[in-house]
C-alpha cells in the first residue's frame, strides 16, 4: 500500500484517519447463494453458480460485529473430486475440487488511547483475513 | 450492518470514526498468481490454482490510490468452455467457464467538510465494489 498521510484535525493524533460510514446506504453483503442445507455432491442445471459448478460449494457465515465487513462468507466444497460434466452427479477422479483462498483486507475495532492514556473512542486496525472464495475444479498436481 | 456509533474526540464530527492504520504491518495483497502473460487455454499440471483449473483464468490489476484496498485483482477467463480433464487442453463444450462475482466492501477517500465548510482532512466512504474472483466450470443452464 502507498502511504496515506495523517488526515486528522489538528487536535487529533498522528497516523489516524477520519472515517465517515458510507454516505450511500450499503446493503448487507450476501453471496450469490446462502444455501446452507444443500450438501449434495452434484452439479445442478440451474440455480446460482456455486450449485451449477462441477466443483460445487456452499457458503458458511463468519460474523464479527467488531470487524468491517461484519459478515464474511467462507466456501466449503461439497465434493472431493469434480462432478462429471456428462452426468452432473458421478465424480471424476481425474479432477480435484480445491478451495480458492484470498487474504481479504478487513478492519477491526480497537480501543483508541489518547496521549495521556485516556480512551478516545475507538480506532480501526487493518488486517488481512483469510477467506475461501470458491471451489475450483483442477487437474491434480503432477510431482516432478 | 449493525450501527457503529460516532467515536470522535469531542472536537470531531458526528458519524465519523478514528481510523488508525494497522499497528501490524500489512504486506501488499497478492493473489495466488499474477501470471498476466499466460493466456493459453489449457489446464496445467502444476503451478497455482488459476492455471491448474479446467476453467483457467488470469488476474488483471485494478489500482486506485484513493481506495482501500488500493489494489484489487479481477479474474479474466482464458477459455469460454471448460478444458477436458483428460487432456488438459481440448475444450469440452458441455461445460462453460463462468466468472464468479463478489461485491467487496471498499473505502474511498473523500474530502471531509467541517461545520463551516472548511476541509478537515479526508474521510473514508464505504462502498460495494464488484470484483470477479475466479472462473468456475459450470454446467450450462437448462431453461425450463
Amino acid at each position: 500500500y502507498s502511504h496515506w498521510p495523517s488526515c486528522c484535525p489538528s487536535k487529533g493524533y498522528p497516523s489516524e484517519e477520519l472515517l465517515r460510514w458510507s454516505t450511500v446506504p450499503v446493503p448487507p453483503l450476501k453471496p450469490a447463494s446462502l444455501d446452507f442445507h444443500s450438501v449434495s455432491c452434484r452439479a445442478s442445471e440451474d440455480g446460482p453458480l456455486n450449485s451449477r459448478a462441477i466443483s460445487p460449494w456452499r457458503y458458511e457465515l463468519d460474523r464479527d460485529l467488531n470487524r468491517l465487513p461484519q459478515d464474511l462468507y467462507h466456501a466449503r466444497c461439497l465434493c472431493p473430486h469434480c462432478v462429471s460434466l456428462q452426468t452432473g452427479s458421478h465424480m471424476d477422479p481425474r479432477g480435484n475440487s480445491e478451495l480458492l483462498y484470498h487474504n481479504q483486507t478487513v478492519f477491526y475495532r480497537r480501543p483508541c488511547h489518547g496521549k495521556k492514556g485516556n480512551h478516545k473512542g475507538y480506532c480501526l486496525e487493518r488486517r488481512l483475513y483469510r477467506v475461501s472464495l470458491a471451489c475450483v475444479c483442477v487437474r491434480p498436481r503432477v510431482m516432478g | 450492518y449493525s450501527h457503529w456509533p460516532s467515536c470522535c474526540p469531542s472536537k470531531g464530527y458526528p458519524s465519523e470514526e478514528l481510523l488508525r492504520w494497522s499497528t501490524v504491518p500489512v504486506p501488499p495483497l497478492k493473489p495466488a498468481s499474477l501470471d498476466f502473460h499466460s493466456v493459453s487455454c489449457r489446464a496445467s499440471e502444476d503451478g497455482p490454482l488459476n492455471s491448474r483449473a479446467i476453467s483457467p483464468w488470469r488476474y488483471e490489476l485494478d489500482r486506485d490510490l484513493n481506495r482501500l484496498p488500493q489494489d484489487l485483482y479481477h479474474a479474466r477467463c482464458l477459455c469460454p468452455h471448460c478444458v477436458s480433464l483428460q487432456t488438459g487442453s481440448h475444450m469440452d463444450p458441455r461445460g462453460n467457464s463462468e466468472l464468479l462475482y463478489h461485491n467487496q466492501t471498499v473505502f474511498y477517500r473523500r474530502p471531509c467538510h467541517g461545520k463551516k465548510g472548511n476541509h478537515k482532512g479526508y474521510c473514508l466512504e464505504r462502498r460495494l465494489y464488484r470484483v470477479s474472483l475466479a472462473c468456475v466450470c459450470v454446467r450450462p443452464r437448462v431453461m425450463g
Epitope: L61, D62, R63, N66, R109 | S2
Partner: antibody
C-alpha cells in the same frame, strides 16, 4: 430495566419435541447489533451454549446439535422460541435465555449481559 | 471448534486470600469473558473482553491474558465470592459461543 423469562414444559418423554419461549422486555431485538441466545445447564454440570439469533434473523446453532435445534423470533411479541426435537434424558437441564449486544466504547461484547432465571426441563419416561 | 479448559476444577481458599483461575483455549482467541454463578442462580457477567469489569463488579476482580491463556484473579477473597466461575469466548467462524467447564471456589 432489562428482564428475560423462560417458559416451557417441566416434564417431557423421550422422543418428544421441547418448545421453550423466552419473553423479554427492556430492549428490542430489532435494534442493530442485538442478539439473544439459549444456554443450558444439566444438574451439577457446566453451561452449554445451544443457539443464537441476531437482530437481522441470522441464526447460529451448536454444531453437534444443529439437526435438532430451531430458533426463531417474534419481534412484535418480544419473544424468542427454541425447539429441540427428539429429546432424550441427557437433555434434562435448566434452560436459560440470555441477551447479547452490549456496546462499549471499544466495541460490541460477546458476553451474555442479561439472563433469565432459567427453567428446569426433565426428560424421563 | 475451540475447546476451553479451566483449571483447577475445584479450588479451596480462605477469605482475604488471593485466587487465580486459569482458562486455556485450544487455539488462539482475541478475547475472553468471565461469569460468576451461585447455586440456584443464573450466571452473572464479571469480565468483558478479557480485562473490562462488568457493571457493579468489585475492583478486587480482574482479568488478563492473550492468545490461548487467560486468567481471572480475585485479589482478596470475600465470603460472597465463593461460587462457580466460567470462562467464555465467541468464535466468529463458525459462529459459536463456548464455555469452560467451570471452576468451583470453596471455602477452606
Amino acid at each position: 430495566q432489562v428482564t428475560l423469562r423462560e417458559s416451557g414444559p417441566a416434564l417431557l418423554k423421550p422422543t418428544q419435541t421441547l418448545t421453550l419461549t423466552c419473553t423479554f422486555s427492556g430492549f428490542s431485538l430489532s435494534t442493530s447489533g442485538m442478539g439473544l441466545g439459549w444456554i443450558r445447564q444439566p444438574p451439577g454440570k457446566a453451561l452449554e451454549w445451544l443457539a443464537h439469533i441476531w437482530w437481522d434473523d441470522v441464526k447460529h446453532y451448536k454444531p453437534a446439535l444443529k439437526s435438532r435445534l430451531t430458533i426463531s423470533k417474534d419481534t412484535s411479541k418480544n419473544q424468542v422460541v427454541l425447539t429441540i426435537t427428539n429429546v432424550d434424558p441427557v437433555d434434562t437441564a435448566t434452560y436459560y435465555c440470555a441477551r447479547m449486544g452490549q456496546l462499549h466504547y471499544y466495541g460490541y461484547d460477546y458476553a451474555m449481559d442479561y439472563w433469565g432465571q432459567g427453567t428446569l426441563v426433565t426428560v424421563s419416561s | 471448534e475451540i475447546v476451553l479448559t479451566q483449571s483447577p476444577a475445584t479450588l479451596s481458599a480462605s477469605p482475604g486470600e488471593r485466587v487465580t483461575i486459569s482458562c486455556s483455549a485450544s487455539s488462539s482467541v482475541s478475547y475472553m469473558y468471565w461469569y460468576q454463578q451461585k447455586p440456584g442462580q443464573a450466571p452473572r457477567p464479571l469480565i468483558y473482553r478479557t480485562s473490562n469489569l462488568a457493571s457493579g463488579v468489585p475492583a478486587r476482580f480482574s482479568g488478563s491474558g492473550s492468545g490461548t491463556d487467560y486468567t481471572l484473579t480475585i485479589s482478596s477473597m470475600e465470603p460472597e465470592d465463593f461460587a462457580t466461575y466460567y470462562c467464555q469466548l465467541y468464535h466468529s467462524y463458525p459462529p459459536t459461543w463456548t464455555f469452560g467447564q467451570g471452576t468451583k471456589l470453596e471455602i477452606k
